[in-house]
Interface confidence: low
């Protein structure tokens, strides 16, 4: 089990590092997006796991971005952000609409809008229960 957890972490790390770099190979990214969306978590240990991924970086030093699957909809009151940015991209994470042609990346206008917890604990619990 420990080996399985280590292997899973390695796969997730590679997925995060390569997120959005190849529009033709998105299966791992979609799977991880789905994990974040379902478990209401972001990143492996912390949401900050995403902050140094180059494809997610904007031009400014503070331009931190995360996949839209990290977005906590219940914490967001800004309807403009929801309607124009988040919902159209999160709608692709449903069971029926899983395909996409580019990485779904959202700016972080306030980091309180993203899930604060990493996914490692939730996934490890899931592994132990199965």
């Amino acid at each position: 089990r420990a080996q399985l957890e280590r292997s899973l972490r390695d796969v997730v790390e590679k997925t995060i590092q390569k997120y959005g770099t190849n529009p033709e190979e998105t299966a791992a990214e979609e799977s991880w997006d789905y994990v974040q969306f379902q478990l209401r978590c972001c990143g492996w240990h912390y949401p900050q796991d995403w902050f140094q991924v180059l494809i997610l970086r904007g031009n400014g030093s503070e331009a931190h971005r995360v996949p839209c699957s990290c977005y906590n909809l219940s914490a967001t009151n800004d309807s403009t952000i929801l309607d124009k940015v988040i919902l159209p991209q999160l709608s692709r994470l449903g069971h029926l609409a899983r395909s996409r042609h580019s990485a779904d990346i959202c700016a972080v206008p306030a980091e309180s809008h993203i899930y604060r917890e990493g996914c490692a604990q939730g996934l490890q619990k899931w592994l132990h229960n199965n």
């Epitope: 972490r9 790390e13 492996w44 240990h45 912390y46 900050q48 796991d49 902050f51 140094q52 030093s61 503070e62 306030a110 980091e111 309180s112 604060r116």
Partner: antibody, heavy 120, light 110 residues
């Protein structure tokens, strides 16, 4: 512009106290772990303390009980309260923003530093 | 607490040289290591995180490697701007959360 600016350094007598401030601009301090790192004249870097985004504090063994890290999110400012100061605390104190990556921490943004001199 | 030992403490080199700095941890820290560059009178500048990852804007001539207890920073072709002091930092966010810096390596002009 994203930056950190320290203040509050100066000359203090042994046994005295000092409070350092670090004003953040261009980003919200409350969303980050923040830390203090010091450097004695002509010496290397020495980790002092960190306060995480939830407010939990961590200290180097030698700093426990004498130094207190805190933050005022409404002022977007980090503090380091230093008590019972000794000559060996003489150093430039840097405020730094901490990022985390897969359980690993590092400091991606640093202030210019403020010099603390402890001498009679 | 983990102790970080850097070597050499001083290194004389010329522009264009390949330079290697090593950092040894007193206990296993996996890949939880960062490197910084510091010039006199300036704040440290963040160079490498998670042992081998370059942040946005750091030139590709800088390369970090290693895991466990042995780590290396390599500058493939030293540039005039690279003469500085380099520090490694253990960065394991465990239950104790104590960070530690190496003693530094000064890269000076030969």
């Amino acid at each position: 512009e994203v930056q950190l600016v320290e203040s509050g350094g100066g000359l203090v007598q042994p046994g005295g106290s000092l409070r350092l401030s670090c004003a953040a601009s261009g980003f919200s301090l409350s969303n980050y772990n923040m830390g203090w790192v010091r450097q004695a004249p002509g010496k290397g870097l020495e980790w002092v303390s960190v306060i995480d985004a939830s407010g939990t504090t961590y200290y180097a063994t030698w700093a426990k009980g004498r130094f207190t890290i805190s933050r005022d999110n409404s002022k977007n400012t980090l503090y380091l309260q230093m008590n019972s100061l000794r000559a060996e605390d003489t150093a430039t104190y840097y405020c730094a923003r901490e990022l985390l990556y897969f359980g690993s921490s590092y400091y991606d943004l640093w202030g210019q530093g403020t010099l603390v001199t402890v001498s009679s | 607490d983990v102790v970080m030992t850097q070597s050499p403490s001083t290194l004389s080199a010329s522009v264009g040289d390949r330079v290697t700095i090593t950092c040894q941890a007193s206990q296993n820290i996996d890949s939880n290591l960062a490197w910084y560059q510091q010039k006199p009178g300036k704040a440290p500048k963040f160079l490498i995180y998670y042992a081998s990852n370059l942040p946005f804007g750091v030139p590709s001539r800088f390369k970090g490697s290693g895991s466990g207890t042995e780590f290396t920073l390599t500058i493939s072709s030293l540039q005039p701007d690279d003469f500085a002091t380099y520090y490694c930092q253990s960065a394991d966010v465990g239950s104790t959360y104590v960070a530690a810096f190496g003693g530094g390596t000064k890269v000076e002009i030969k």
